[in-house]
Interface confidence: low
């Protein structure tokens, strides 16, 4: 019995179905086929869970969180024992193993391993200003999304006819910050933060209004 090499790793957007491949060759009939799918969750590597089981011609549910979401892609028994997981959740991220036994065919590699990563687009980021908006001050524009896998990067743009930040601005796309030094009236305007990762983007807006000093009455 020989389980075929798997693609190694699969990525899927949260909520979308995933197919975890596992196929094998065997010299024996599939009368005594026994297939166990296990997962080692990324969130709890010390606690492997059973996903689904095929034994004695019957299918059995695995861990409760997979109930109603998991099944074999084809009619069993078969040499293709791939499974699907519907409505993928963040907690489904982990390393999946298919363990295949088909007596009397013993020997060879009977385990296939596939990694599953559930990706999450950035949630609507939160934009805010830190620091005084008085002319001549330094301000920091902050942007962060609560959700996003892989971790989003953040790009700030000034929404004027250049779509560029002022020359006095420095940007950290990992932290989502822009520091604008010595702000002037020209720094005023609408700024947009675009949070992006492999599967999506989301934006927020921020209105920076630089405050000019009030003229003093002399008298």
């Amino acid at each position: 019995l020989e389980v075929s090499e798997s693609p190694g790793s699969i990525q899927v957007a949260r909520g979308q179905p995933a197919v975890l491949p596992c196929t094998f060759t065997t010299s024996a009939a599939l009368i005594n086929l026994n297939v166990i799918w296990m997962v080692t969750p990324l969130s709890n590597a010390n606690q492997p869970e059973q996903v689904i089981l095929y034994q004695g011609g019957q299918m059995f549910d695995g861990a409760p969180r997979f109930h109603g979401r998991v099944g074999f892609t084809g009619t069993m028994p078969a040499t293709n024992v791939s499974i699907f997981i519907n409505n993928t959740q963040l907690s489904d991220t982990g390393t999946y193993q298919c363990l295949v036994n088909n007596l009397p065919d013993i020997g060879g590699r009977n385990i296939g391993v596939t990694g599953l990563t559930v990706l999450v687009p950035p949630s609507a980021p939160h934009c805010q200003i830190q620091g005084s908006q008085d002319i001549g001050s330094d301000v920091i524009l902050l942007c962060s999304s609560e959700e996003g896998i892989p971790r989003p990067t953040y790009l700030w743009e000034k929404l004027d006819n250049t779509l560029k930040l002022p020359p006095t601005a420095t940007q950290d796309q990992v932290q989502g910050t822009v520091t604008i030094r010595n702000i002037s009236a020209l720094s005023s305007g609408l700024y947009q933060c675009v949070a992006s990762n492999a599967i999506g983007t989301s934006t927020c807006l921020l209105d920076l209004q630089v405050i000019s000093p009030q003229p003093r009455n002399i008298g």
């Epitope: 609507a124 790009l155 743009e157 929404l159 004027d160 983007t201 934006t203 927020c204």
Partner: antibody, heavy 120, light 107 residues
Framework: QVQLVQSGAEVKKPGASVKVSCKAS????????MHWVRQAPGQGLEWMGW????????NYAQKFQGRVTMTRNTSISTAYMELSSLRSEDTAVYYC?????????????WGQGTLVTVSS | DIVMTQSPSSLSASVGDRVTITCRAS??????LNWYQQKPGKAPKLLIY???SLQSGVPSRFSGSGSGTDFTLTISSLQPEDFATYYC?????????FGQGTKVEIK
Amino acid sequence: QVQLVQSGAEVKKPGASVKVSCKASGYTFTGYYMHWVRQAPGQGLEWMGWINPNSGGTNYAQKFQGRVTMTRNTSISTAYMELSSLRSEDTAVYYCARGGQQQLVLDDYWGQGTLVTVSS
Amino acid sequence: DIVMTQSPSSLSASVGDRVTITCRASQSISSYLNWYQQKPGKAPKLLIYAASSLQSGVPSRFSGSGSGTDFTLTISSLQPEDFATYYCQQSYSTPRTFGQGTKVEIK
């Protein structure tokens, strides 16, 4: 004056791809976002995404993620929208629209629309 | 995604009538709300941006109001050229979602 001129109507088979172009004139192409909006026959407007012609950065509606690609060629002031794995429900008029007041709206400068028909 | 809900979906009115169309957002969008008019076979035309600002060249009989989640487009005295479909659209976040449209027909 500002003009957006789109490519002509297309008929495609399910599973194929279509690439619609939008040639801009009368303004600085790299200074304004370009949005793409579609409208199925008898239906409402559906925003697909935008491209920043300056940086090439894009922002796609989640519904089209993985199927749509927006690009631009700044040397000829043209934006492109390519939609792949076409299905019958992609039959629609596709519009490009320039970002307007503070880039927040799709302003009065729209292309004339390109009808894409997906039929076997 | 922010869901924009327009009401009514259609209405019949006469020339000279005052017409009001409402648009509700599923979450607060501040004043980032735009109104468009579309006639058959034509591209949409911007009427109002930022909830209440009249686009240049648009007749003053069109006005917009509201902030947060509830918005209104008002046509103070309906003219023959105003029979069309009207859409609201939020520009607070992506995707830039539209309402389903309100068709204004001749009574």
